[in-house]
Interface confidence: medium
Amino acid sequence: LPKAPVITTPLETVDALVEEVATFMCAVESYPQPEISWTRNKILIKLFDTRYSIRENGQLLTILSVEDSDDGIYCCTANNGVGGAVESCGALQVKMKPKITRPPINVKIIEGLKAVLPCTTMGNPKPSVSWIKGDSPLRENSRIAVLESGSLRIHNVQKEDAGQYRCVAKNSLGTAYSKVVKLEVEVFARILRAPESHNVTFGSFVTLHCTATGIPVPTITWIENGNAVSSGSIQESVKDRVIDSRLQLFITKPGLYTCIATNKHGEKFSTAKAAATISIAEWSKPQKDNKGYCAQYRGEVCNAVLAKDALVFLNTSYADPEEAQELLVHTAWNELKVVSPVCRPAAEALLCNHIFQECSPGVVPTPIPICREYCLAVKELFCAKEWLVMEEKTHRGLYRSEMHLLSVPECSKLPSMHWDPTACARLPHLDYNKENLKTFPPMTSSKPSVDIPNLPSSSSSSFSVSPTYSMT
């Protein structure tokens, strides 16, 4: 007698590994024999699809080599024209051993920055990822975390984070290990011992001592009054990532000696500087034909702006140059209390470096003016509005003329860095904070410095400490 189809073995969930065989069985009782069709996610599986084998009159569906994308709901439908068609469905869950799809790579990172070692994985069940440093499992802490993606993130990288790392991906089917990678931590050049200033008699021997560290170990160069040291002997030794340099000098003239420690980080260099002055007793009394002399800055107003122990030019056209120049700065400084927080630190740097110009010692001490480009940057980028107001006040006679001449330089009359970079002084404030300038190139002077966030307030001495540190 004709009998409508009945599925005697309903489909079940099948777990299968990638590249293995997976079989669904759909046992049917009926008369006459039914036609059995198969679907995956409601899409008909074609009989001639070579990825599948359909046997036993359609009752067995075999996936010959399971792929990741075969996941889904498989249904068999039986129909013999007697009664309605019947259907049974089951899921295929593709199981996969852990696989590391994006392994970590060797990383060189500067101390204090954030390092991320990638480790992206595949697998079913989803693998858990852990990390090994050296031979031990890595413990997470407030700085070190394994991200949801499996990547390892290290905040504020420290020297002790350097070493060999590998990631481990684990699930119920197995474990995968990445290759071992190296995290190298580089450290900016830093001066541990700065050279000391000396006041000596003419013809003395003096040894200046400078010690620096960093990873890689820095090199030390000595600069005399802005130029490479031309005389004197240098002895160097390196031990435990510390370089020790001694410069022995025969003193015949006063000078500013700078120890510069430099190390390389990829294409960039980090430098640390420390300076010492060598003065000769009775030397720097101004002679009649001199316009001024070099001396260490001993005032207060520009302390946070000028480098520590900076040699500045004191103008002997004043009866008491130190007092007079300090008063000029003080008067102009008070005017700056009302300017914007963006303009103020730049204007202070310009003001101090203009009134107390860097001094090149020698038989005739020479002031080193500010570079034109830095002057323009302060005038047009940081202080466009304020500069206009200041010039207006000057024209209306609200400043004493010498006050204006000294505190507001005429940028176009200053030497350009293009001519001779050593013939003019840079404003360290502008160098140090260059990465803080988000809006660049500068907008027009009608849209001045308010576009520039995050510049430090005048109380910040981050740009003026000595030894100074800068990336070049």
């Epitope: 323009l376 840079r426 660049f440 190139p441 500068p442």
Partner: antibody, heavy 124, light 107 residues
Framework: EVQLVESGGGLVQPGGSLRLSCAAS????????IHWVRQAPGKGLEWVAS????????YYADSVKGRFTISADTSKNTAYLQMNSLRAEDTAVYYC?????????????????WGQGTLVTVSS | DIQMTQSPSSLSASVGDRVTITCRAS??????VAWYQQKPGKAPKLLIY???SLYSGVPSRFSGSRSGTDFTLTISSLQPEDFATYYC?????????FGQGTKVEIK
């Protein structure tokens, strides 16, 4: 000696792509800005794009925005201009030029060194 | 965008003449204006930067000046090698613009 050498120009069909390279030597690439400037036959100079190495900031002329991408590989001292969806009006000699100076003062420096130029022809 | 309107578009002059080329910015700009000289088939050469600074190696007969939004390139005494096309350029805003050029020809 400072040198900028462009390469990658040639004939391309409208809608096609081309990548220009600018190999630099003789200066600190990472503290300079690189600009691409083009000149259509018989016409004046037209700025195309700039990249400020110290900040990574990029800027584009309206005529190329969304189609061209400027980039720099400081490890290779090379700047690139990826040009997609090219049009007949992009036909020009493309120069790369640099501005020196620290971050704030680059714009006061002018483009002091230029390459010899590479010709890009967009035609069917 | 800041437009740089350069005038004249061309001029004829003789050796020894004083030549003045002007660029007017469409809005207030800083001193970030440069002048270039270009000869046929060659890359431009920087003459003046920061509106009035003479680039190293450029003869002193070239000079630049600024008055508000007007920028001027002056050649005090034209020489045979000065016959070329001159361009002004501003980089005061993030979008750089060039003037349309002035061709200096022999009279």
């Amino acid at each position: 000696e400072v040198q900028l050498v462009e390469s990658g120009g040639g004939l391309v069909q409208p809608g096609g792509s081309l990548r220009l390279s600018c190999a630099a030597s003789g200066f600190t690439f990472s503290s300079s800005s690189i600009h691409w400037v083009r000149q259509a036959p018989g016409k004046g100079l037209e700025w195309v794009a700039s990249i400020y190495s110290s900040s990574g900031s990029t800027y584009y002329a309206d005529s190329v925005k969304g189609r061209f991408t400027i980039s720099a590989d400081t490890s290779k001292n090379t700047a690139y201009l990826q040009m997609n969806s090219l049009r007949a009006e992009d036909t020009a000699v493309y120069y790369c030029a640099r501005s020196g100076g620290e971050f704030y003062i680059t714009s006061y420096y002018g483009m002091d060194y230029w390459g010899q130029g590479t010709l890009v022809t967009v035609s069917s | 965008d800041i437009q740089m309107t350069q005038s004249p578009s061309s001029l004829s002059a003789s050796v020894g003449d004083r030549v003045t080329i002007t660029c007017r910015a469409s809005q207030s700009v800083s001193s970030a204006v440069a002048w270039y000289q270009q000869k046929p088939g060659k890359a431009p050469k920087l003459l003046i930067y920061s509106a009035s600074s003479l680039y190293s190696g450029v003869p002193s007969r070239f000079s630049g000046s600024r008055s508000g939004t007007d920028f001027t390139l002056t050649i005090s005494s034209l020489q045979p090698e000065d016959f070329a096309t001159y361009y002004c350029q501003q980089s005061s805003s993030s979008l750089i613009t060039f003037g349309q050029g002035t061709k200096v020809e022999i009279k």
